[in-house]
Amino acid sequence: SWMWNQFFLLEEYTGSDYQYVGKLHSDQDRGDGSLKYILSGDGAGDLFIINENTGDIQATKRLDREEKPVYILRAQAINRRTGRPVEPESEFIIKIHDINDNEPIFTKEVYTATVPEMSDVGTFVVQVTATDADDPTYGNSAKVVYSILQGQPYFSVESETGIIKTALLNMDRENREQYQVVIQAKDMGGQMGGLSGTTTVNITLTDVNDNPPRFPQSTYQFKTPESSPPGTPIGRIKASDADVGENAEIEYSITDGEGLDMFDVITDQETQEGIITVKKLLDFEKKKVYTLKVEASNPYVEPRFLYLGPFKDSATVRIVVEDVDEPPVFSKLAYILQIREDAQINTTIGSVTAQDPDAARNPVKYSVDRHTDMDRIFNIDSGNGSIFTSKLLDRETLLWHNITVIATEINNPKQSSRVPLYIKVLDVNDNAPEFAEFYETFVCEKAKADQLIQTLHAVDKDDPYSGHQFSFSLAPEAASGSNFTIQDNKDNTAGILTRKNGYNRHEMSTYLLPVVISDNDYPVQSSTGTVTVRVCACDHHGNMQSCHAEALIHPTGLSTGA
């Protein structure tokens, strides 16, 4: 059987000869050289060589336990002559013994960490870790202890865990933001002779809201022209906050002052400035100076720092309204005037008034915008603003005239304003009523007396206030001995009725009826219209069958004896 124990070998051997490991030996070995010892497995023939006759094993190279702590090899004892193994092939172990040849190495060369400013003493910052490649199961070669070389009195490190904690109260980021801490890890439990490694920990204090906003001045003054429309920025104010990020965010508000309703403040998120803007239209002539109380506050406040005081500040903002040369202002936004259509030229319709709103009260002259009155129907007195006609009017041609009047400061023609004038032309009864259409009707030869053969309608271009009231009658020259009568229906219509039984188209094929239409307005207007009545042959239903076409072709041959 094999005769050996586990082999142990000290690492990092520095001798000049090969390092002796041990001896493989079989009890079958008679010492006569008849056996050959063969080594195979981890490092056989390279790291480990065997004297094939004696079984002595040597290490040819310096071994590093941290690279490989155990080598597993196989041994054979073979009869040189036959190749017959005299023992079963057996596995054996060469265990490399540790020496303290490795210093602790931190997992990072440089650590970065953050901790909130003003943290309590003992607040966790970061944990550093160093590993030692030496054997942790043997001695203290891999027992690491942490200590702080640089960074006191601000930070401390737990010797066993490598946990870095704050060690000083009220560390203020606004005073100092960056700290470089150097931590040492030492093996041998920190004892003399131990190997050590260091790492740098860059610690940044992160901001907390421990500073209120502060205005750099107590009073601000801005000027703005009275013409500034709502929304116009008139000035910027800025409170400073020693904090950063959202802790330095500022909200501005107007809390007091007679300009409370006239101005707004908005916060510019990018610059953290308060922008004072116009809220309502200003008027220098009414108020020349406003004062505002503006407050700057942190929207996010940490309750634990409220003992430091309110996280807001206020400043007074004085706003001076500057006079602007303003255009004249009309007394109305628009004027509506009326005039009768029968007005004579130079009739005054009405007047407009405009005033310079400025303190100077510059005189004003008036004119008509000729683009709005191309036909020059109207004119204006440049001094007093009276509007008058310069041409005759006709309501039936144009009911409304829309013109623009311009008021211009005499001393500064650039300052002008415009106002619309809506002139309504009032109706006058200056048009006679007339037939709504050309009437040409027929009567059957066998018509009976008082038979309605046509209804008449009239139109009138006028537009009387109480509506139209037309009357219809036969013209006086045709009234006696007429074959037809006119019946006024009193509803602005009239009917033509037959006056006898039967008509003979061969005796009289066409009748011309002169009809007088009158209105009842003042002055009364009337006109005469002619209705043509043809005599036709009809069927027993009264449907026309034939008429004399000649009546239409040769009107000169027609009789007028209606």
Partner: antibody, heavy 117, light 111 residues
Framework: EVQLVQSGAEVKKPGSSVKVSCKAS????????MHWVRQAPGQGLEWMGD????????HYTQKFKDRVTLTVDKSTSTAYMELSSLRSEDTAVYYC??????????WGQGTTVTVSS | DIQMTQSPSSLSASVGDRVTITCRAS??????????MHWYQQKPGKPPKLLIY???NLESGVPSRFSGSGSETDFTFTISSLQPEDIATYYC?????????FGGGTKVEIK
């Protein structure tokens, strides 16, 4: 380079003896056993015996035990095989071969021994 | 004595063919996981040449188309792809027990 060089061909009378030499080079002569194998014309291989050059320990096959003698001269790294009482059936090619763990890894070129009256 | 029976005694195969030779020992030639069986090639007029030792180990410088396997009493020698230069007689040999003995040989020819 390992080489085994054998002596030349021999023609012998029945009843006589023959001694074949085998000179080794290219390795440590005393570290390996030397074997002798013969091959009759058209026949297979037949192991005769071997010798340990360091101690001159020998092993013979039963068939040749009384007629074969294996010897070495360490000074010249030469091995010898002597076969006595030759018979016609001893006509064969005789090879020396280096033994290593039961296998023949190097062979001589062979010596033809003819036994004829 | 351990008898070595080799078969076939001769065979003819084409170039590229897989050739298998078996050798049966009359008793086991294995001990402690080592198989004391070796294979040789002999060409006419030349001494034998070691190809495989300890049943399956390829001797240095021998082409990889030659291989061996087996244990105890049954062993196999294989040429994976027969080449023209492989024409020879192949022998098995045991070193387990004196006297060391050879198989009768297998003569390999090309068709």
């Amino acid at each position: 380079e390992v080489q085994l060089v054998q002596s030349g061909a021999e023609v012998k009378k029945p009843g006589s003896s023959v001694k074949v030499s085998c000179k080794a080079s290219g390795y440590t002569f005393t570290n390996y056993w030397m074997h002798w194998v013969r091959q009759a014309p058209g026949q297979g291989l037949e192991w005769m015996g071997d010798i340990d050059p360091s101690h001159s320990e020998t092993h013979y096959t039963q068939k040749f035990k009384d007629r074969v003698t294996l010897t070495v001269d360490k000074s010249t790294s030469t091995a010898y095989m002597e076969l006595s009482s030759l018979r016609s059936e001893d006509t064969a090619v005789y090879y020396c071969a280096r033994g290593d763990l039961g296998r023949f890894d190097y062979w001589g070129q062979g010596t033809t021994v003819t036994v004829s009256s | 004595d351990i008898q070595m029976t080799q078969s076939p005694s001769s065979l003819s195969a084409s170039v590229g063919d897989r050739v298998t030779i078996t050798c049966r020992a009359s008793e086991s030639v294995s001990i402690h996981g080592t198989h004391l069986m070796h294979w040789y090639q002999q060409k006419p007029g030349k001494p034998p040449k070691l190809l495989i030792y300890a049943a399956s180990n390829l001797e240095s410088g021998v082409p990889s188309r030659f291989s061996g396997s087996g244990s105890e009493t049954d062993f196999t020698f294989t040429i994976s792809s027969l080449q023209p230069e492989d024409i020879a007689t192949y022998y098995c040999q045991q070193s387990f027990e004196d006297p060391w003995t050879f198989g009768g040989g297998t003569k390999v020819e090309i068709k």
